[in-house]
């Protein structure tokens, strides 16, 4: 089902999108992800805020927690204990960074319908979770980890050295949260809750980024974050495991780091429990082309964790960095030693491999000039994964099932032909033992979520079909969208073009390039969106194009690793090449071409504007990186190496926006940044502005006081209104 994009006889009742539509979120969609609690039961928060339990087999639903109870503590979230005796209710949500937040937690006892009194949890808590079995609680408060055997029990303190901005236990520091894990937590229960593993991050030697938060006090506050920029001192990480049944008996036991990793700076990248007494840790050298997966076993006699060298598996890249954006995680099979993992095959495409003893002897499960993207679930007889294989469109995602119980394994695409026009980009969520699963389709048509039988793949019911959205769009003139490719010098450039509703190839249109272009990103995806660029095409008659050039993902290592150690070169070249090809198509007004981007996209748009090609009349950079020396070590060094003379300092210096200040003279440039950006620091834009002023180059700028990298809330409305005015002026479009 696709929203009608053809002109019908009632054309006069159809209207274009307005900026107000976009800012009000009028055409936003809903998805439905079941909160699975067994093979055939799931929880869902209803529209009126009741917590409802659904039993798929019987079709019955049960309200297990009323909105009245939720409202009594102003709860915005909940979590049922695995033994179903208690529910935690989360309130006073206070956002910190991308994933992290603090909150107040109340424990509700389902057996007597009352809140647990006595030994209440402290506030605010940084992270809280139930054990996988029963109702033990682990939580992090003031950077220390605590354990409760039952919600009403007094807590057992596991760590004592936690200190704000110095030592983090069970939660990541800034850089691990944003660039490595990436989660708000750094603790992991073993499958039956016998052990609790956690990370300790020592940030004592990390330089601190400090910026003003203006608030409304007489004196601004200073925000201090230990933030390692490229080449700076990094956090020191250690992994510990504690027996939660007798936590005081031997206390936390450290898991040893593989010798080949420990010999220089390194990262911990993830932890996967295999059984209650076997754990798998992944480590990465600071120069991120060598990753080690280490399988460790509990030694009952010594009460320690043993990680034999024979259970170390090395993953190395000779052409780029290890993995895609992150090193992939293993999915273990039922024998608790072999596992499935996605990594590059000999042809340079990311595929699923089965590792039984050594990586060298890995059995390749998928293959082809496409990529396996995620392994969702491995059962006794099936492996479910997503890929972009179908019809050779890299920007699609379909779900596949491989039978692993039979030989040779047979492959079935579960989603390819379900709603072919409407749905080409899926994700999935599986119940225990994959008895049932939900499919969430993101487009290109209106998103829809459905429930399926895990054995037959039969659709059981529609969970969310966005009927209201479909009705609301009936009288809207949406732009047309096409996804195609350009073949240029042995490089395939996929692009998405968003065209005005009455598009006529014989006319000339202003062109706006929207760019992100970061390593391992993908912008050209078959997903539904009614957003700012939809409005620009629908109402303002612009053509908008998104192009996936070198450095982008899911099309093989040749394209992905082309930017290795050379950020800011090929990404920009490929946007320029695409623009030239678009001009050749004959419907672009070459005097009215603009480019805009946010974050990495702001960096690329700035470099494109300063490329000296004369192609762009104007452009916008929102929260851009301006020099890789200003950005986070974990991200930057993955792609650029170190900013040292004997490594890659030269390219760090050559790839700054400031070095091209002179070239902005002949373009209209709008530079935008939030002053409280914890991620891409305001420093980046401050340095661009300084360089432009020093070069006596005119430009426009807007800062957003106390706003972070997301420029949310009222700033969003101001931002898009401001950018709209800028573009309309640039393209000589009347207001």
């Amino acid at each position: 089902l696709r929203p009608s994009r053809v002109h019908n006889s009632e054309e006069n009742t159809m209207r274009a999108l307005t900026l107000k539509d976009i800012l009000n979120g009028t055409f936003s969609y809903k998805t439905f992800f079941p909160n699975w609690i067994s093979g055939q039961e799931y929880l869902h928060q209803s529209a009126d805020n009741n917590i409802v339990l659904y039993n798929i087999e019987t079709g019955q639903s049960y309200t297990i927690l009323s909105n009245r109870t939720m409202k009594s503590v102003n709860a915005s979230n909940y979590g049922l204990s695995p033994d179903r005796q208690f529910v935690y209710l989360e309130s006073d949500y206070s956002k910190l960074w991308r994933y992290s937040y603090t909150a107040t937690y109340y424990i509700y006892d389902l057996s007597n319908g009352e809140f647990v009194r006595g030994n209440e949890l402290p506030r605010p808590i940084q992270y809280l979770c139930w054990s996988p079995v029963g109702s033990k609680l682990a939580y992090v408060y003031q950077n220390n980890i605590y354990l409760k055997q039952r919600p009403g029990d007094p807590p057992f303190q596991i760590t004592f050295n936690g200190r704000e901005n110095k030592i983090f236990n069970g939660i990541p520091d800034w850089v691990y949260e944003e660039e490595m894990l990436p989660t708000k937590y750094a603790l992991w229960w073993s499958p039956n809750g016998k052990f609790l593993a956690y990370a300790e991050f020592n940030d004592k030697d990390i330089p601190v980024i400090a910026y003003s938060y203006y608030g409304d006090e007489q004196y601004p506050r200073t925000i201090n974050i230990p933030y390692p920029k490229a080449g700076a001192k990094n956090p020191v990480v250690r992994i510990f495991i504690i027996d939660t049944t007798y936590p005081a008996y031997v206390g936390p036991q450290e898991v040893p780091v593989p010798a080949m990793i420990a010999s220089s700076d390194y990262y911990f990248s993830w932890l996967t429990w295999v059984t209650d007494e076997r754990v798998c840790l992944q480590w990465l050298k600071r120069v991120q082309n060598v990753s080690v997966l280490s399988i460790c076993d509990f030694r009952e006699d010594w009460q320690t964790w043993d990680c034999p060298k024979t259970q170390e598996h090395i993953e190395e890249s000779r052409t780029g960095w290890a993995g895609g954006f992150f090193v992939s995680r293993p999915v273990f099979s039922y024998d608790a030693i072999s596992y499935y993992k996605i990594f590059s095959d000999k042809d340079g495409y990311k595929h699923i491999h089965y590792i039984k003893d050594t990586v060298e002897n890995a059995i390749q499960i998928t293959s082809g000039k496409w990529e396996a993207i995620n392994i969702f679930r491995v059962t006794q007889d099936s492996l479910f994964y997503s890929s972009n294989e179908f019809e050779e469109y890299p920007g699609r995602r379909n779900i596949y099932r491989i039978s692993i119980g039979s030989y040779p394994p047979s492959k079935k695409c579960v989603t390819c032909h379900l709603r072919k026009e409407r749905c080409q980009y899926y994700t999935a969520s599986f119940s225990d033992y994959a008895k049932y699963y939900a499919l969430v389709c993101y487009g290109p048509g209106i998103p829809i979520s459905t429930l399926h039988d895990g054995r037959t793949d039969q659709e059981i019911k529609i969970l969310e079909e966005n009927k209201e959205l479909e009705n609301a769009l009936k009288n809207i003139q949406l732009p047309k969208e096409e996804i195609k490719k350009l073949e240029v010098d042995e490089i395939t450039l996929w692009y998405k073009m968003i065209l005005p509703p009455q598009f006529d190839r014989s006319k000339k249109y202003p062109l706006l390039i929207q760019v992100y272009g970061g390593p391992c990103s993908q912008s050209v995806r078959s997903v539904f969106a009614v957003n700012w660029i939809s409005y620009l095409a629908s109402k303002e008659g612009m053509v908008i194009a998104l192009v996936d050039g070198r450095g982008t993902a899911f099309q093989g290592d040749k394209l992905l690793y082309a930017v290795y150690r050379k950020l800011g070169v090929y990404e920009v070249e490929d946007q320029i090449t695409a623009v030239r090809k678009f001009i050749e198509m004959g419907f672009i007004d070459e005097k009215r071409i603009a480019i805009w981007g946010w974050s990495y996209g702001g960096y690329v748009s700035s470099l494109a504007l300063a490329s000296g090609t004369g192609l762009f009349k104007c452009g916008i950079a929102v929260a851009p990186v301006s020099s890789w020396e200003y950005y986070a070590s974990v991200y930057t060094e993955r792609f650029m190496g170190l900013p040292t003379k004997d490594d890659n300092l030269e390219h760090y210096k050559n790839s700054t926006v400031m070095a091209r200040a002179e070239y902005f003279r002949n373009v209209d440039y709008l530079l935008i940044h939030g002053t409280a950006d914890d991620n891409v620091h305001f420093q980046n834009s401050a340095q661009i502005a300084k360089a432009l002023v020093n070069a006596q180059v005119d430009f426009q700028a807007m800062w957003y006081s106390d706003q972070n990298h997301g420029l949310s809330g009222l700033s969003t409305n101001h931002l898009y209104t401001h950018m709209t005015h800028f573009l309309k002026q640039c393209f000589s479009l009347s207001d």
Epitope: S38, Q40, E41, L53, N55, E57, T58, Q60, Y62, I64, L80, D83, R84, Q85, D109, L110, S111, N112, G113
Partner: nanobody, 123 residues
Framework: QVQLQESGGGLVQAGGSLRLSCAAS????????MGWFRQAPGKERELVAA???????YYADSVKGRFTISRDNARNTVYLQTNSLKPEDTAVYYC?????????????????WGQGTQVTVSS
Amino acid sequence: QVQLQESGGGLVQAGGSLRLSCAASGRTFSTYAMGWFRQAPGKERELVAAISNGGSAYYADSVKGRFTISRDNARNTVYLQTNSLKPEDTAVYYCAARRGSAYYTNRIDWPYWGQGTQVTVSS
């Protein structure tokens, strides 16, 4: 170990009421969660209502507001008051027990069962 015996079923007209009882043997009745399930011909056995050892109850949305579950720990009995009965309520009604939480809706999670009592609602 707990033994369960249901009673109170019968034939009733649509809109009518019945009170089902379930007598349990054993001194530890008060520590068990109790539930009422029903099974119509050719259909899955489904949980209708359950009550925890602490007295907290919940219901299938299809019977909410019409059925009431209660327990009398002194009499080792759990009740299901069924009002405004509909023809689709026709089924064999089973009493079930489990240790721990009442908030399980799969029959497999309830180890102890009665023999069942027939409820027939005529239109």
